[in-house]
Structures are given as C-alpha cells and as structure tokens.
C-alpha cells in the first residue's frame, strides 16, 4: 500500500533507502531540456516475488529541444544542480548490495535523468537520514523514518535527528567511512 505522503523533511539533512519494498514507484524524471518518452510508463516499479525482486519498466528521456515547448510554468528560484558522476553513484551502490526478500536495490541511473529521484514509498519502508556536508548530527534516537499504517491512514515516524554546526557527514547503515563519498550522497539517491 502506498504511503500517502513523503518522508519528513529534516533541515540540512537528506534521506535514502537502503532497499525498496515491492510496490515502490520511482518517477521517470528527466533533467532540463529532456522529457520522458511518450510511450512507456511514467514510473519504474519494484516488482517480483518473495525470492526475487527487480525494477519493472525502464525510464527513457528524450531531448525536448526540437519540440516547440512553451514556458507555461513559474520558474524555480534556482536551477537544479548538475548530477554527480556515475562513478560516485556506483561507489554508493556497492555499499547497497543488500539482498532483502521482497525488496529492490537502488536502480541504476538512466541517461539524462533528473537531479533528484522522486519515489512513492509503500507501507513498511524505512528511510535513513544523514546531515549534509558541513553539518553535524545530534541524535536523540534513530535517524530513520518508517511509513506505518494506523487506523487506515499512513504516516511516517519522526526521525530523531538534528543537524547542526560544522563537521563530516554522518553515515548510512552499511556504508564505508566517509572518504568513499566525500560530498555526501549522490544526488540521484537523495530527497530534499
């Protein structure tokens, strides 16, 4: 069952999942100047059975430069940051070689993918938080949030994390020391 809303936002922190439960959707988003192809699902889906899960549908982006697209949307205050390198994503994915039944790993990047990945999570999903570079984690409890179903409604638990001050970024479960990823998370695996 899909979670009704997105995980909580923590100031100066990003979150990611180590693995994604079946039923999770990942929107096929493209970077500026590109758009999703007109045939094909608007999202990838983590699907499968208890023994093997994988991402169904493939996201594809095509150049929108040739099209006469009129700007009808109020522009964003800032342009999106450039995506970090695929090498860095691969480094992060090496830390993600988990094999949880009924879960998918982080899907590989697709060409001209947008900077930020937009997931629709399902009930039971856990996401983990870390402070962005330059902020120190003050923990009052687990720096994670779980989507739970109570009385027919979904809600995310509140992560017990405050990010303050100057220091190295904290780590997600199962990751190496920060030098493997000095700039924090690859953009594709963060949500702000």
């Amino acid at each position: 069952e899909l979670c009704d809303d997105d995980p909580p936002k923590i100031t100066h922190a990003t979150f990611k999942a180590v693995a994604y439960k079946e039923g999770t959707m990942l929107n096929c988003e493209c970077k500026r100047g590109f758009r999703r192809i007109k045939s094909g699902s608007p999202y990838m889906l983590c699907t499968g059975n208890s023994s093997h899960s994988s991402w169904d549908n493939q996201c594809q982006c095509t150049s929108s430069a040739a099209r006469n697209t009129t700007k009808q949307v109020t522009p964003q205050p800032e342009e999106q940051k450039e995506r970090k390198t695929t090498e860095m994503q691969s480094q992060m994915q090496l830390a993600d070689q988990v094999s949880l039944p009924g879960h998918c790993r982080e899907p590989p990047p697709w060409e001209n993918e947008a900077t930020e990945r937009i997931y629709h999570f399902v009930v039971g999903q856990t996401v983990y938080y870390q402070c962005v570079q330059g902020y120190r984690a003050l923990h009052r409890g687990p720096a994670e949030s779980v989507c739970k179903m109570t009385h027919g409604k979904t809600r995310w638990t509140q992560p017990q994390l405050i990010c303050t001050g100057e220091t190295e970024p904290s780590q997600f479960p199962g990751e190496e020391e920060p030098q493997a990823s000095p700039d924090g998370l690859p953009e594709s695996e963060t949500s702000r």
């Epitope: 809303d5 039923g23 045939s39 094909g40 699902s41 697209t69 937009i118 629709h120």
Partner: antibody
Framework: QVQLQQSGAELVRPGTSVKMSCKAA????????IGWIKQRPGHGLEWIGD????????NYNEKFKGKATLTADTFSSTAYMQLSSLTSEDSAIYYC???????WGQGTLVTVSS | DNVLTQSQKFMSTSVGDRVSVTCKAS??????VAWYQQKPGQSPKALIY???YRYSGVPDRFTGSGSGTDFTLTISNVQSEDLAEYFC?????????FGGGTKLEMK
C-alpha cells in the same frame, strides 16, 4: 494530508473561455505531474492532458489541443486549465489529479449555456 | 489511441458475493493499468495501480490482476458500500485512456 482543491462551478456563454484552478496541498507540488480529466454523462472519463509543475512540460490529448491550455504556478502550488471557444460539448465535470492519479480533486462543473 | 473495453456495462451482485470486472486493451500496456471506483456525485477514487498493487486504505477484498491486454478487478465478499462504477485506465502511452466503466448493482 494530500488534497487537491478545485475552483467552483462555472456557468458560461458559448464562444467564451473559462479558467479553473486546482490547488495542491500535502505533498511537494513540483515533484509530480498534474493531470486533467473530463467527465460527461454517457461519455465516461477522458484524459485531457497533464503538466509537470517542476519543469516546462505539458502533454495534451490531440482531441483537446487548441481547446485546453494547462499552466501552473509553483509559488501557490496551483495548476490551471483554461478552456476556450466553449460549446455545449464542453459542459462537463473536470477533475484534476495528482501524484500519479492517486489523488483527485472534487471536480469543477462547467455548464455552457446561452 | 489505445482503446480500453469494459464489455459489461452493468453487473448484478449480492452482499457476500465475489465479482470480477474485466478490462481489455487494444494494445499491450504491460502492467501499466489502474482501477478507480466512482460513487454517484463523487470523484473517482484510486483503488489499484500497476495492475495489482492496492493504494493505501483500500480494503484487501479488492484485487487487481492481469498484464498485456487483459485485466481484472476482483471484489471478494462484496459489501453494500462497493456498489459503484468501476473504471480501468492505461498509462502506458499517451494519450492515457479509460475504459467505459462497469456499474455494480444489487440483485
């Protein structure tokens, strides 16, 4: 709580235009496409088009090109649909949808009558 | 355009019954199909996405199945509140299209 609040019913003259709104709350507006659907008794549901508020993108059903114009204002988290050169065929309930069709507005009834 | 056909416009049922609403696509859509429930005077409500996954708050008596061109929404142990119109939708390719609807009525 995710909500899509649509503007009120409209009674309009043939040949004129109407602009309706859909205000989103409870999720990140710029992350998801907003779709627009037409429903007329005996005609079922028709997909008009969609707009990505976080970019410059719109998609239209060929049938509604020139009839519908979709826009969005990211600062007020509101999507708009304008219908032009109205005829009795445009009398219908129009719905906006968000978060991959998971949520629907309450609908805006448009009645075209002289 | 990909035409979705719901061959039965009306289906009669009784409380406690099991009923299956079918939807056939003119072109392969994989599993990119959703099901909606609409009660008189209300907006459609999303029940199923990706052919077989339930949205939150949807009772587990609603089950979606199928892939390719043939899809089914099954309601087991029908309740009186399930009497409504049911629509299928494909979102595999633009323009997205809907089935004509199937109205569930009491015998």
């Amino acid at each position: 709580q995710v909500q899509l609040q649509q503007s009120g019913a409209e009674l309009v003259r043939p040949g004129t235009s109407v602009k309706m709104s859909c205000k989103a709350a409870g999720y990140t507006f710029t992350n998801y496409w907003i779709g627009w659907i037409k429903q007329r008794p005996g005609h079922g549901l028709e997909w008009i088009g969609d707009i990505h508020p976080g970019g410059d993108y719109t998609n239209y059903n060929e049938k509604f090109k020139g009839k519908a114009t979709l826009t969005a204002d990211t600062f007020s988290s509101t999507a708009y649909m304008q219908l032009s050169s109205l005829t009795s065929e445009d009398s219908a309930i129009y719905y906006c949808t968000g978060r991959n069709f998971a949520y629907w507005g309450q609908g805006t009834l448009v009645t075209v009558s002289s | 355009d990909n035409v979705l056909t719901q061959s039965q416009k009306f289906m009669s049922t009784s409380v406690g019954d099991r009923v299956s609403v079918t939807c056939k696509a003119s072109q392969n859509v994989g599993t990119n199909v959703a099901w909606y429930q609409q009660k008189p005077g209300q907006s459609p409500k999303a029940l199923i996405y990706s052919a077989s996954y339930r949205y939150s708050g949807v009772p587990d008596r609603f089950t979606g199945s199928g892939s390719g061109t043939d899809f089914t929404l099954t309601i087991s142990n029908v309740q009186s509140e399930d009497l409504a119109e049911y629509f299928c939708q494909q979102y595999n390719s633009y323009p997205y299209t809907f089935g004509g609807g199937t109205k569930l009525e009491m015998k």
